[in-house]
């Protein structure tokens, strides 16, 4: 992106009165600005070459050395090289543009040859969702926060199939279901009332729900358990 | 002579100018494509890129299969004999699990179950071979010398293996490599 800046200074082009300084909008601003810069360089190149031609016409009779032609050729040569480099860069490394975009994720990833980018590395995919399978134990609140920081949410289970799959791979993990007290209903982290059966619900100290081998059961929110995060596509 | 030189430089300039314009147009198109690609994608989330999923089969696993690292796994919840498991995997254009290393299944390390894997004893080679004919690496199962040749091998994700009668019904894992 800086290459265009070099073109500017080499050409000493006057500022474009029509071009406003744009505030970057999200992740695409650099590209927008670059397009404007390219157009601007193009227009001003034409103007510059016209000026050179004008000078040449007036000076031609005096048989002065053809400095403007050489200068124009030199400048065009440099521009050609720079543009060629830009084209090659964009064609050869298509990921360079998306790199900044992807780096904003907390899960910075080193791309493997086979890694297709469906999910961050070390996450698993299953039926249109990505799962982070945690190894470390956390309290329910810590697990909720850890998943939020991973741009995902604490495990939610949408159907019987997913329930079977999750109990097969990890039968003891926090889920995104809790209640304020035993007098309150079980709710999901989205605030919806949770209707599925949770065992041991009559224990007043058990206000967070976990997945276990035979379904869901309540437990103390302060106890440490493995946590999984989920991100739906 | 000066006129010829001037004409030559003009010719060079003109050619370079045309090259510049075509390169600029190319760059513009490339940038525009990159820009639209970015504006279509949401801010990065850990979720798979659905565009990718549609475009390239090499990158996505079938429904109810687990994608991890560069492989797809079918983790059964029903039990079959070793042969039934092998046939099921074959019918899914995959094979019973061939382990590359001991931590391959670390995403399911808290699972309690044992699963049939694609390891069987070859009388011909007097060795334990994977379905593709490659030999079992010694460090995978240090206890493999105690395995009975007539048995089949069940594995759990904690890294333990045991030999059982091939007619025993166990869960099983099929594996498909993405690349």
């Amino acid at each position: 992106m800086d290459n265009q800046g070099v073109i500017y200074s080499d050409l000493n082009l006057p500022p474009n009165p029509k071009r406003k300084q744009q505030k970057p909008k999200g992740n695409t601003s650099s590209i927008l600005v670059t397009e404007q810069e390219i157009t601007y360089v193009e227009l001003n190149l034409q103007k510059t070459s016209q000026d050179f031609q004008g000078n040449y016409k007036t000076n031609h009779c005096k048989d002065l050395p053809s400095v403007p032609e050489k200068l124009i050729a030199g400048i065009l040569g440099i521009i050609c090289l720079i543009l060629m480099a830009s084209v090659v860069t964009i064609v050869v490394i298509p990921s360079t543009l998306t790199q900044k975009h992807n780096n904003s994720s907390l899960n910075t990833r080193t791309q493997k040859a086979c890694h297709c980018g469906h999910c961050p590395e070390e996450w698993i995919t299953y039926s249109n969702s990505c799962y982070y399978i945690g190894k470390e134990k956390r309290t329910w609140a810590e697990s909720l926060l850890a998943c939020t920081l991973k741009n995902s949410s604490l495990l939610s289970i949408d159907n019987e199939e997913e329930m079977k799959f999750l109990t097969a791979i990890s039968p003891s993990t926090w889920t995104g279901v809790f209640r304020d007290s035993s007098q309150h209903p079980w709710v999901t982290i989205n605030g919806l009332t949770f209707k599925h059966e949770i065992k041991d619900s009559d224990n007043a100290e058990h206000n967070c729900a976990m997945l276990h081998a035979r379904g869901l059961k309540s437990d103390r929110c302060g106890s440490s358990k493995i946590y999984h995060c989920k991100h739906k596509l | 002579m000066a006129v010829f030189k001037t004409t030559l430089w003009r010719l060079i300039s003109g050619t370079l100018g045309i090259i510049c314009l075509s390169l600029m147009a190319t760059l513009g198109i490339l940038l525009k494509n990159s820009f639209t690609k970015l504006s279509v994608e949401p801010a990065y989330t850990p979720g798979p890129n659905i565009e990718l999923q549609k475009d390239s089969d090499c990158c996505s696993c079938h429904e109810k299969w687990v994608g991890y690292r560069c492989n797809c796994y079918f983790i059964s919840s029903e039990e079959k004999t070793w042969n039934e498991s092998r046939h099921f995997c074959a019918s899914q254009k995959s094979s019973l699990l061939q382990l590359q290393n001991r931590d391959e299944l670390d995403f399911m390390s808290s699972s309690q179950h044992f699963y049939w894997i694609g390891l069987s004893y070859s009388e011909e080679h007097t060795a334990w071979l994977w379905e593709n004919g490659s030999a079992l690496s010694q460090y995978l199962f240090p206890s493999f010398e105690t395995f009975k040749p007539k048995n089949c091998i069940a594995y759990n994700s904690k890294g333990n293996a045991l030999d059982e009668s091939c007619e025993t019904k166990n869960r099983y894992i099929c594996k498909q490599q993405l690349i």
Epitope: E160, T193, F194, H196, E197, S201, D202, L216 | -
Partner: antibody
Framework: EVQLQQSVAELVRPGASVKLSCTAS????????MHWVKERPEQGLEWIGR????????EFAPKFQGKATLTTDTSSNTAYLQLSSLTSEDTAIYYC??????????????WGQGTLVTVSA | DILMTQSPPSMSVSLGDTVSITCHAS??????IGWLQQKPGKSFKGLIY???NLEDGVPSRFSGSGSGADYSLTISSLESEDFADYYC?????????FGGGTKLEIK
């Protein structure tokens, strides 16, 4: 421990109404669906309907539409069945039940002991 | 409404016997069936849900099977406490409907 407590019996006049209660303990009724079932010796078991205590949504068997009204009081963790315009046909034992609802599998795991309603002049 | 036809209405059996009670639905119900037990003068107790799954605390001598429209409850090696009334209930669609019941008596 999950329990559903119902009053033992109600004696009512024909044409009157009766409101039966079912008080739950060991769980919060907002987290399940509460059902009502009618039992008569010759007719067997008939499902009346169910209510979602979290939002008051109800489903009824067509036969009981207009006859039965289902409500809940979440503060007392109680479900109610009101029967109107009573006739001798409404003489029966009425049971409340907690729906077992879990990812594709449902059913009745817990039941109240039933309230005998006798409609008699 | 889905009609649930339960058979037999009653049966006399001895302790230690194995018995099967069947329920036929007027249309396929995809395992959306439960089995209930009612002891004389008592309330109901859930035994089986979703066709084959045992409710918590139910002895393993009870088992459920079936698919489509036909389902059965099997009690192996009957014990004295198993003599009661048994009902099937479908919850594939509203209104939920019950079988007519089977009375299990000691021979």
């Amino acid at each position: 421990e999950v329990q559903l407590q119902q009053s033992v019996a109600e004696l009512v006049r024909p044409g009157a109404s009766v409101k039966l209660s079912c008080t739950a303990s060991g769980f919060n009724i907002q987290n399940t669906y509460m059902h009502w079932v009618k039992e008569r010796p010759e007719q067997g078991l008939e499902w009346i309907g169910r209510i979602d205590p979290a939002n008051g949504d109800t489903e009824f068997a067509p036969k009981f539409q207009g006859k039965a009204t289902l409500t809940t009081d979440t503060s007392s963790n109680t479900a109610y069945l009101q029967l109107s315009s009573l006739t001798s046909e409404d003489t029966a034992i009425y049971y409340c039940g907690r729906e077992r609802y879990f990812y594709g599998s449902r059913g009745f795991a817990y039941w109240g002991q039933g309230t005998l309603v006798t409609v008699s002049a | 409404d889905i009609l649930m036809t339960q058979s037999p209405p009653s049966m006399s059996v001895s302790l230690g016997d194995t018995v099967s009670i069947t329920c036929h639905a007027s249309q396929g119900i995809s395992s959306n069936i439960g089995w209930l037990q009612q002891k004389p003068g008592k309330s109901f107790k859930g035994l089986i849900y979703h066709g084959t799954n045992l409710e918590d605390g139910v002895p393993s001598r009870f088992s459920g099977s079936g698919s489509g429209a036909d389902y059965s409850l099997t009690i192996s090696s009957l014990e004295s406490e198993d003599f009661a009334d048994y009902y099937c209930v479908q919850y594939a669609q509203f209104p939920w409907t019950f079988g007519g019941g089977t009375k299990l008596e000691i021979k």
